[in-house]
Interface confidence: low
């Protein structure tokens, strides 16, 4: 399991806002945000990334296919770019991913999982925003 404490959080935030968020919202299109309760949370920026990584790339019995989605590919690229040594930890994970069956239908559980992901990303951004607000407060 990768330790996310040394990532460049600002760069990850920029990538999320620029592309990943749009792909997540596209995946959820036609689904209201109120359709699912957020049951997964995170308590700090590295912890949020740990949970995001787990939900995005670890298959669950009712949703095994998220890792092939566009938002997942972009998430992987972002983490590889801004988290030192992340790529090396993902070689085994990638090999395991290739063995998974493709699913043609976006199941309700996948939609629920992506809804949880959106919540985790928002929590990550909000924590980061708080950090930036505090720095701004100190410098003015």
């Amino acid at each position: 399991m990768y330790d996310f404490t040394n990532c460049d959080f600002q760069k990850i935030e920029a990538d999320y806002l620029r592309t990943i968020s749009k792909d997540l919202i596209t995946y959820m299109s036609g689904t209201k945000s109120t359709d699912f309760n957020n049951t997964v949370s995170c308590s700090n920026r590295p912890h949020c990334l740990t949970e995001i990584q787990s939900l995005t790339f670890n298959p669950t019995p009712r949703c095994a296919s998220l890792a092939k989605e566009m938002f997942a590919r972009k998430t992987k690229a972002t983490l590889a770019l801004w988290c030192p040594g992340y790529s090396e930890t993902q070689i085994n994970a990638t090999q395991a991913m290739k063995k998974r069956r493709k699913r043609k239908v976006t199941t309700n559980k996948c939609l629920e999982q992506v809804s949880q992901l959106l919540g985790l990303w928002r929590r990550f951004i909000r924590t980061l925003l708080k950090k930036q607000l505090e720095h701004h407060h100190h410098h003015h």
């Epitope: 399991m1 404490t5 308590s43 700090n44 590295p46 912890h47 708080k130 950090k131 607000l133 505090e134």
Partner: antibody, heavy 117, light 107 residues
């Protein structure tokens, strides 16, 4: 400079409730989460719960659900913790402490709660 | 919940000595560990977070190390003001939990 001001002592009777305060200054109150920690005499530290002052989102330690209620008043930059149905087991020092990434960089001086008839 | 086991529970050392306190969580917490010092009748004071990052104003004789399920706090060349109780705390997720404390006394 950052300060978290707490009243020194609270003396209450068993079965009653108490609402203790924590007034923050020296930083933007809504920027940090506010946590509460319990320390019984001669004992270690126990996390009670956390509140996000920006939206009053709370998370409690399962052990303190129903015992502690966390609230904030952003207009006065004050966090509150109410403890109900007090017993001698609740006699302790209670600290408020701020956090962003789960570790606590500033602490209040603590409020000593004595539950006695 | 993640339990944090600190050792030793207490130790005596002389000024100038080097001491090491260890902390073992019951599960992998990566680098999400903080160390605090508490003096009698005072609030805890942050020393280290993310296992090895020294908090602002903390002297360089303090150092944190470890990851996963094994962590340590090392204090080089003990000073009179270093005596007190030391606590570890995981900040991986809720509920945040603390170790039982290590009482560092003057020999």
């Amino acid at each position: 400079q950052v300060q978290l001001q707490q009243p020194g002592t609270e003396l209450v009777k068993p079965g009653a409730s108490v609402k203790m305060s924590c007034k923050a200054s020296g930083y933007t109150f809504t920027t940090y989460w506010m946590h509460w920690v319990k320390q019984r005499p001669g004992q270690g530290l126990e996390w009670i719960g956390v509140i996000d002052p920006s939206d009053s989102d709370t998370t409690y330690n399962q052990k303190f659900k129903g015992k502690a209620t966390l609230t904030v008043d952003t207009s006065s930059s004050t966090a509150y913790m109410q403890l109900s149905s007090l017993t001698s087991e609740d006699s302790a020092v209670y600290y408020c402490t701020r956090s962003l990434d789960g570790y606590y960089d500033y602490w209040g001086q603590g409020t000593t709660l004595t539950v006695s008839s | 919940d993640i339990q944090m086991t600190q050792s030793p529970a207490s130790l005596s050392a002389s000024v100038g000595e080097t001491v090491t306190i260890t902390c073992r969580p019951t599960e992998n917490i990566y680098s999400y560990l903080a160390w605090y010092q508490q003096k009698q009748g005072k609030s805890p004071h942050l020393l280290v977070y993310f296992a090895r990052t020294l908090a602002e104003g903390v002297p360089s004789r303090f150092s944190g190390s470890g990851s996963g399920t094994q962590f340590s706090l090392k204090i080089n060349s003990l000073q009179p003001e270093d005596f007190g109780i030391y606590y570890c705390q995981h900040h991986y997720g809720t509920p945040w939990t603390f170790g039982g404390g290590t009482k560092l006394e003057i020999k």
